[in-house]
């Protein structure tokens, strides 16, 4: 990038530069016409017959250097060919010399600094590549010479440029004074400021563009070269912040559009919001879950939003005494998650009707919660109780939802408790054809014993047809029509309002062989 300090092509008023000495044949300011047919201010000198050693000087106005260390001067000039000038003496030249003089203010006068090399600093002696001859018509009168010179290093506030003619016939068509600077550059989302090089190469620190953040590693820097070019080197730059993506050739970060998001800084573009989420603003790093949908704390920010599952279905209970097997089907809606578990809540109601959460005497296998399989076995149920089990399905976002958790209920009422087994049977009398039995009254938990059932059969006769039953309301019974001298196995059970209790242990009894023995009391 070039920053102009002076460009005579753009000047419309007279330049009014200073000449020395004030004599005929001196540099003269004239109007000219450039290649684009624009009128330009020019300086011409044509003293080809001058006395040897005499020089014509032309000095520009004071030019502030504006921080430039090296300044470039592009000269456009024409020069007549000495050979085509019949009256040109041997002093005719086809060169001229360029000088500069530095100062901290516009202090030069018509006579100072002295018009000579030192104090003026010589830049170069400029020779014409293209010489103008007498026109053979109206075509271009001669190619314009273009020469760029480098001044410096400069240290003072400004400078003058001076031209010394020693016998040329030439015109200075334009002077462009400029310095080179590295233009503001944005690369890899890193902005490097416009920089005037002070040395051969200057390191320049970059800064992240708006909505970008530095990438890990050393802070980005580029080198600005003296020629105004950035030195090519890889840039560990910046990356777009969450909610922003790189755009326009990695020169700026653009906010994610509505309905899209970018969760992390770095490369990558904005993605559509995942299922059941939305972003109503631009620049979203995360999409908000729809009402009723959530992300678990452990879910990635880019994960879809999920919802708690619906209730389990079709709970089936199988009661077996004080044990209950519950089984159910998975919920219709899993909520979009894989981490489905089940839990049970339990209430129990006593026969009298008072209800409370189930007590600690119940055991659940594998457990009351965090069940991954759809079944559980409950043990320790109390008789004649009504149990309500609520089976709920849960997932990773159930804890985030408000409102009631859907459940599938099941009611189970256990049987009332039957009398215990009758086991202490004794034979009070025996005869060849009968046995008189008695037993202790069992302690029935649910009311009095209403009656008893005696089950007996001859030992060795195991078939169903050989088994006989006898009911009695007392805690005794007489078994008649028995075989003489035969062995019998006897069992008794008691009945209360809750039903029959279990048969007790088999009791072994024997009838008498003959009558003479009579009735004999036997103690079991």
């Amino acid at each position: 990038l070039e920053e102009t300090l002076l460009n005579t092509k753009l000047e419309t008023a007279d330049l009014k530069w200073v000449t020395f000495p004030q004599v005929d044949g001196q540099w003269e300011e004239l109007s000219g016409l450039d290649e684009e047919q624009h009128s330009v201010r020019t300086y011409e000198v044509c003293d080809v017959q001058r006395a040897p050693g005499q020089a014509h000087w032309l000095r520009t106005g004071w030019v502030p250097r504006r921080g430039a260390v090296h300044v470039y001067a592009t000269l456009r000039f024409t020069m007549l060919e000495c050979l085509s000038l019949p009256r040109a003496g041997r002093s005719c030249k086809e060169t001229f010399t360029v000088f500069y003089y530095e100062s901290d203010a516009d202090t030069a006068t018509a006579l100072t600094p002295a018009w000579m090399e030192n104090p003026y600093i010589k830049v170069d002696t400029v020779a014409a590549e293209h010489l103008t001859r007498k026109r053979p018509g109206a075509e271009a009168t001669g190619k314009v010479n273009v020469k760029t010179l480098r001044l410096g290093p400069l240290s003072k506030a400004g400078f003058y440029l001076a031209f010394q003619d020693q016998g040329a016939c030439m015109a200075l068509l334009s002077l462009h004074l400029f310095y080179k600077k590295c233009a503001q550059l944005t690369v890899n989302l890193t902005r490097f400021p416009e920089t005037v090089p002070r040395e051969l190469v200057v390191p320049v620190a970059g800064s992240c563009v708006v909505d970008a953040v530095p990438a890990p590693g050393p802070s980005p820097s580029l080198y600005c070269r003296e020629d105004g070019q950035w030195a090519e080197q890889p840039v560990t730059g910046c990356s777009c912040a969450p909610g922003f993506e790189a755009a326009e050739g990695n020169t700026k970060c653009r906010a994610c559009a509505q309905g899209t998001f970018k969760p992390l800084s770095g490369e990558g573009s904005c993605q559509p919001c995942p299922a059941n989420s939305h972003s109503n603003t631009i620049g979203s790093a995360v999409c908000q879950c729809r009402v009723g949908y959530f992300r678990a704390r452990t879910d990635p920010r880019g994960a879809p939003c999920t919802t708690p599952p619906s209730a389990p279905r079709s709970v089936v209970s199988r009661l077996n005494g004080s044990s209950l097997h519950l089984e159910w089907s998975a919920p219709l809606e899993s909520g979009g998650r894989e981490d489905l578990t089940y839990a049970l809540r339990c209430r129990e109601c006593r026969p009298g009707g008072s209800c409370a959460p189930c007590g600690g005497d119940l055991t659940f296998d594998p457990g009351p919660r965090d069940l991954v399989e759809p079944w559980v076995v409950v043990r320790g149920l109390r008789p004649d109780f009504t149990y309500t089990f609520e089976v709920t399905a849960l997932n990773g976002v159930s804890s985030l939802a408000t409102g009631p958790v859907p459940f599938e209920p099941v009611n189970v009422t256990t049987d009332r408790e039957v009398p215990p087994a009758v086991s202490d049977i004794r034979v009070t009398r025996s005869s060849p054809s009968s046995l008189s039995l008695a037993w202790a009254v069992p302690r029935a938990p649910s009311g009095a014993v209403l009656d008893y059932e005696v089950k007996y059969h001859e030992k060795g006769a195991e078939g169903p047809s050989s088994v006989r039953f006898l009911k009695t309301s007392e805690n005794r019974a007489e078994l008649r029509g028995l075989k003489r001298g035969a062995s019998y196995l006897v069992q008794v059970r008691a009945r209360s309002e809750a039903g029959y209790g279990p048969f007790g242990q088999e009791h072994h009894s024997q009838t008498q062989l003959d009558e003479s023995e009579g009735w004999r009391e036997q103690l079991a």
Partner: antibody, heavy 126, light 107 residues
């Protein structure tokens, strides 16, 4: 503004010669083209020739070749046009004119004449 | 020499009229053509050079166009001071030539 001042009116006999001068005041002279243009009474303009003083030699219209001589003196910034073998049809106002730009300060030489002398009437009569 | 033919030789027009004068070269002269205005008893005045470049100080109602062999001078809105004779002038050759002139008179 440069001025071109021409010599005064002349009355000449047929067969004679006339030399008209054109003095440029102020500034560069050598690198401008100086043209001579004549205008017979009631007629149009007629280009006769031109000189760029620094180059010395002039260019002439074919019609006047051999009869006209254009010269320049850089030391006095004066151009001259001499026409010989005068005839009555050479009666005219003779103008000198300077080009808008020097040969060095224009990319294309349009030889556009933006400075004119006041004209010199030359009458050829026996 | 290159011949320059102007047309018309003369024309009558009123103030405010748009006036067009043409000039034809006998061979290609690119854009090396100038236009001059001359009033009676005065030296010619340069109006346009290079076919279309307006000379400094000339009113913008004057314009020129053309290249090669056909050229035009246009006065967009004729003013009282514009009544004069107009000449084209080619400088393509080492030998310049003028057109014969076009007289613009008051109607």
């Amino acid at each position: 503004q440069v001025q071109l001042v021409q010599s005064g009116a002349e009355v000449k006999k047929p067969g004679s010669s006339v030399k008209v001068s054109c003095k440029a005041s102020g500034g560069t002279f050598s690198t401008y083209a100086i043209s001579w243009v004549r205008q017979a009474p009631g007629q149009g303009l007629e280009w006769m020739g031109e000189i760029i003083p620094i180059f010395g030699e002039a260019d002439y219209a074919q019609k006047f070749q051999g009869r006209v001589t254009i010269t320049a003196d850089e030391s006095t910034s004066t151009a001259y046009m001499e026409l010989s073998s005068l005839r009555s049809e050479d009666t005219a106002v003779y103008y000198c004119a300077r080009s808008s730009y020097t040969i060095l300060t224009t990319y294309y030489n349009y030889n556009a004449m933006d400075n004119w002398g006041q004209g010199t009437l030359v009458t050829v009569s026996s | 020499d290159i011949q320059m033919t102007q047309s018309p030789s003369s024309l009558s027009a009123s103030v405010g009229d748009r006036v067009t004068i043409t000039c034809r070269a006998s061979q290609n002269i690119n854009n090396f053509l100038n236009w001059y205005q001359q009033k009676p008893g005065k030296a010619p005045k340069l109006l346009i050079y290079g076919s279309s470049i307006l000379q400094s100080g000339v009113p913008s109602r004057f314009s020129g166009s053309g290249s090669g062999t056909d050229f035009t001078l246009t006065i967009s809105s004729l003013q009282p001071e514009d009544f004069a004779v107009y000449y084209c002038h080619q400088v393509s050759d080492t030998s310049d030539t003028f057109g014969q002139g076009t007289k613009v008179e008051i109607k």
